[in-house]
């Protein structure tokens, strides 16, 4: 499928336009801000998200920026520049001229530069870490019971392979989630770990991606797991390369 | 609970179609992916396809890509196999098999489906 | 495709008897330490139940018995005790990449 027939609409991405103008009166669905047409019965890359949510009408809300010491993304929200297969471009650049490298889930790798700033390849994410704390229970979940769980969501709602889950950690109230995917690992029409975990992310913090669909309602042996804050890490192939001045 | 429950047998003509129902209650229906398995007699299992629940569509085993379609109607709770163009070596039992938690394996399996074909 | 080769297809044995099945997958179905690689059981005339996930972890609800060990590509199914009720046919099965495949099976009878 492409997308919804019935009423042409894009399940995986409500930042989309649809019409049935594709081959044969198909629906087909473009990405807001990019234009790029999307296969709305997988994830949509987190470049072409990225950049529809920088296009959305803007509302009130601030930005949360994380600890500036967590290796996370602190840079927040920027336009992204993606390629034609929607994947993030190694070098971004803002509307002054300042450039940098980011990874392939758009997180950036080196200190900012100028418009000579060369960014040899889209280095991949191949190991990320989502850490959650969830909100106060009767009592612990059961740490085999959690790790289906989770497994099954990956599975069945983000279409992730359970072999990319490299494992569940979990130390009440702290649950961590591995995601593990090297390049010779992917095959085509796999999902790639870093949209998986961007979807998970903007789930569970009740900004779900997905159209129609009720939000997240993650439910351990029927108990709900409710989070309360969410850090992601990510881990690249090749090790990023910042100036020690940004260490110190 | 968990209970697939699978339609009855069939006895079908060379070159027809045989469309086989699964039908699963005790647990959310959209909350797991459905397989399908077939065993001819006296031989192995050969897994089909799986279809999301969720997303409404199928992946399949090349073997069977152009004759099998997998679909799924979450009002009903109920998964469906239609093979076509059906040949003598189809004649097998047929199963739906719900994906566990966690790794992919079949945690629960219908009944079976006895397809006959034969002239 | 992976390949699968379970042996023996086919064994015999005493109550109370340790029977041990093997499979050999043509690829590593371990990702990170988790072997996609399942044992089920089939009685005649029934559908399969599962009995060892994940290459060793033991389903719900199914008897200490039966255990699974191994990773990788060698795989092996035991039944400590062999009881009248394990008459059956044993399939592996890998779950890693599809289209999922399984072992030819191994018929077990009681001597």
């Known amino acids: 499928h492409t997308a919804a027939q019935d009423n042409c609409t894009c399940p995986t991405n409500k930042m989309t336009v649809c019409s049935p103008d594709g081959p044969g009166g198909r629906c087909q669905c473009r990405a807001l801000g990019s234009g790029v047409a999307v296969d709305c019965s997988t994830l949509t890359s987190e470049c072409l998200l990225l950049k529809a949510r920088m296009s959305a009408p803007k509302n009130a809300r601030t930005l949360v920026r994380p600890n500036e010491h967590a290796l996370v993304d602190n840079d927040g929200l920027y336009d992204p520049d993606c390629d034609p297969e929607g994947r993030f471009k190694a070098r971004q650049c803002n509307q002054t001229s300042v450039c940098w490298c980011v990874n392939s889930v758009g997180v950036r790798r080196t200190d900012k530069g100028d418009l000579s700033l060369r960014c040899d390849e889209l280095v991949r994410t191949h190991h990320i870490l989502i850490d959650l704390r969830h909100r106060p229970t009767a009592g612990a979940f059961n740490h085999s019971d959690l790790d289906a769980e989770l497994r099954r969501l990956f599975r069945e709602r983000y279409r992730l392979h359970p072999k990319f889950v490299a494992a569940v950690h979990y130390e009440q109230p702290t649950i961590q989630i591995e995601l593990r995917q090297n390049t010779s690992q992917k095959a085509a029409g796999d999902v790639d770990i870093g949209d998986a975990a961007y979807y998970f992310e903007r789930d569970v913090k009740g900004e779900s991606l997905f159209q129609g669909r009720g939000g997240l309602d993650l439910r351990v042996r029927g108990e709900p797991l409710q989070v309360e804050r969410t850090l992601i890490y990510y881990l690249d192939e090749i090790p990023p390369k910042f100036s020690m001045k940004r260490l110190t | 609970q968990v209970q697939l429950v699978q339609s009855g047998a069939e006895v079908k003509k060379p070159g027809s179609s045989v469309k086989v129902s699964c039908k699963a209650s005790g647990y959310t229906f959209t909350d797991y992916s459905i397989n399908w398995v077939r065993q001819a007699p006296g031989q192995g299992l050969e897994w089909m396809g799986v279809?999301?629940?969720?997303?409404?569509?199928?992946s399949y085993n090349q073997k069977f890509k152009g004759r099998v379609t997998i679909t799924a109607d979450e009002s009903t709770s109920t998964a469906y196999m239609e093979l076509s163009s059906l040949r003598s070596e189809d004649t097998a039992v047929y199963y739906c098999?719900?994906?566990?938690?966690?790794?992919?394996?079949?945690?629960?399996w219908g009944q079976g489906t006895l397809v006959t074909v034969s002239s | 495709d992976i390949q699968m080769t379970q042996s023996p297809s086919s064994l015999s044995a005493s109550v109370g008897d340790r029977v041990t099945i093997t499979c050999r997958v043509s690829?590593?179905?371990?990702?990170?330490?988790?072997?996609?690689m399942h044992w089920y059981q089939q009685k005649p005339g029934k559908a399969p139940k599962l009995l060892i996930y994940?290459?060793?972890n033991l389903e719900s609800g199914v008897p200490s018995r039966f255990s699974g060990s191994g990773s990788g590509t060698d795989f092996t199914f035991t039944i400590s005790s062999l009881q009248p009720e394990d008459i059956a046919t044993y399939y592996c099965q890998q779950s890693y990449e599809d289209p999922y495949t399984f072992g030819g099976g191994t018929k077990l009878e009681i001597k």
């Open positions: 994940r290459a060793s």
């Open positions: 279809i999301s629940t969720y997303y409404g569509d199928a």
């Open positions: 098999a719900r994906y566990g938690d966690g790794y992919n394996q079949f945690d629960y």
């Open positions: 690829e590593s179905v371990d990702s990170y330490g988790n072997n996609f």
